[in-house]
Amino acid sequence: IWELKKDVYVVELDWYPDAPGEMVVLTCDTPEEDGITWTLDQSSEVLGSGKTLTIQVKEFGDAGQYTCHKGGEVLSHSLLLLHKKEDGIWSTDILKDQKEPKNKTFLRCEAKNYSGRFTCWWLTTISTDLTFSVKSSRGSSDPQGVTCGAATLSAERVRGDNKEYEYSVECQEDSACPAAEESLPIEVMVDAVHKLKYENYTSSFFIRDIIKPDPPKNLQLKPLKNSRQVEVSWEYPDTWSTPHSYFSLTFCVQVQGKSKREKKDRVFTDKTSATVICRKNASISVRAQDRYYSSSWSEWASVPCS
Amino acid sequence: RAVPGGSSPAWTQCQQLSQKLCTLAWSAHPLVGHMDLREEGDEETTNDVPHIQCGDGCDPQGLRDNSQFCLQRIHQGLIFYEKLLGSDIFTGEPSLLPDSPVGQLHASLLGLSQLLQPEGHHWETQQIPSLSPSQPWQRLLLRFKILRSLQAFVAVAARVFAHGAATLSP
């Protein structure tokens, strides 16, 4: 058993049939010594008396809010949550496996630049009685600070018969050093509580591996005289790290016909302009990637050829 | 060329070669199958690699003030990785794929380190970890880790030389 926060405790249970469970001793936070009784949740049934209560926690029915009283007055509460371990593996019932970039990916994170700011998100099908708390650090043995905000519901989607809820959180490394080569990964820890079930999820990454620039901005076409060619130009996204002579991007320019089956023409360039042939009804798209480290490409920025 | 006395390197040449190094490092190990390195053991070889840290002066401001600290750090790393790529980890069993660019990568690391430090000038180089052969089955994992680490190192080096070529070239 361990304390998650004040008056909230997590009991770690091996979850198999006929498991003996965990013996837990609760102590009433009071100077009083006698006349103390204990109840669980809204029930008025007295579970025991005395300053301490010993219980055998085996299942969710044994978890909940234990309250000690004296003469009708509430003295203190202890909320017991359960963390299930089945076949040696902690349960992951609350969050959905996003399966990208590999199985058992529950948290996904992205950064728009090297400033030390990043966003993580996760998915669940649970809509009520759900709370999250997020902690993060750089490194684990001698952790350096990363400050995370509160997790918020950022999207709702219908997937078949189910509703899916996306939560996200923004974090910022306290003393980020954008130009340095990271040697210790960022660790993100999410505590999830659904009713009386506790689970924790972690992700470990380098900012460089989760970089995904915003799409290029101000995408423009300039027709070239007496030619089907056009000059496409664009700019670095505002959110990208500066100076651009140091934090450089590379770009992919694509000419795509109306039909998805039509052959795509692609050009790769380090410049912020390119000359391409504009076909009728086609569109021109440009995306960006870090020039020197193969992290994710940005989403496409597009303009029609006409 | 960067020399301990403080003259400038051939920024443009260094920029071209460091960008080539980035391409080679990624073609030597594209991120396929996404192995989570932090779940694996055998850390000792990759823990000792020289990283370009915050105080090494490789940021734009630090390069403007005095690029020598940063160039020395980059040189140190290039020599370190050049030794690792020539070590048993890469030259031993199991064989690399026939068209593996590791040989080219090895030669380019040496080429860039020589651009930074001509013969006769000696910066202190970091101690190379023991190159005694690990068991062959450990090597694929070590190769993977070293190449991933090298990708990060050469990315910073390439940014330094690109910025130097754009803003510090005579």
């Epitope: - | 048993d88 030259t91 064989s95």
Partner: antibody, heavy 114, light 112 residues
Framework: EVQLVQSGAEVKKPGASVKVSCKAS????????MNWVRQAPGQRLEWMGV????????TYNQKFKGRVTITVDTSASTAYMELSSLRSEDTAVYYC???????WGQGTLVTVSS | DIVITQTPLSLPVTPGEPASISCRSS???????????LNWFLQRPGQSPQLLIY???TRASGVPDRFSGSGSGTDLTLKISRVEAEDVGVYYC?????????FGSGTKLEIK
Amino acid sequence: EVQLVQSGAEVKKPGASVKVSCKASGYSFTDHNMNWVRQAPGQRLEWMGVINPNYGTTTYNQKFKGRVTITVDTSASTAYMELSSLRSEDTAVYYCARRGFAYWGQGTLVTVSS
Amino acid sequence: DIVITQTPLSLPVTPGEPASISCRSSKSLLYKDGKTYLNWFLQRPGQSPQLLIYLMSTRASGVPDRFSGSGSGTDLTLKISRVEAEDVGVYYCQQIAEYPFTFGSGTKLEIK
């Protein structure tokens, strides 16, 4: 084209030493370790040791307890295997094989006889 | 040292028929990188060994697809789907998981 060309057959007396050479061509000599393997008449193949041509680091089969020494001359792209304190059971064909074992020398017959 | 036990010692086969050779390792050759560190060779009379299969199941360059390798970490098999006259010789398996590398005792394939 990758080629490993070994030195010619040798006849040695018991207690003597033999040094077999293996000249490599068609690839960058320092990019690949070189193994040495032997095969006594009618016997299975037996791995003797390996050398990293970059640094000269070696790993030997303990069966040969200090009797085997593998060296390289990188300027000549040549690997050498020396076996000392020869006995009659060392009569065998000795092969060099590049890392990966896809390329082998043609073999060198060493006969130990009084 | 890892001991490799190879069977059978001799294998008479009719051309066009399949053939199978087994090697058993005293220690698993499958490691956490998912690779199984076993090679198969053919040594024709008077020649140097020729690599057929590496990493248990990958055919070496120029090796016909009638040769295939499979197995678990300890029990490994070389199969020839249809034996041809040119396949005669001694077949060896070799582990390259740990030093010293060790070979099987060999299987002599002959045409009936």
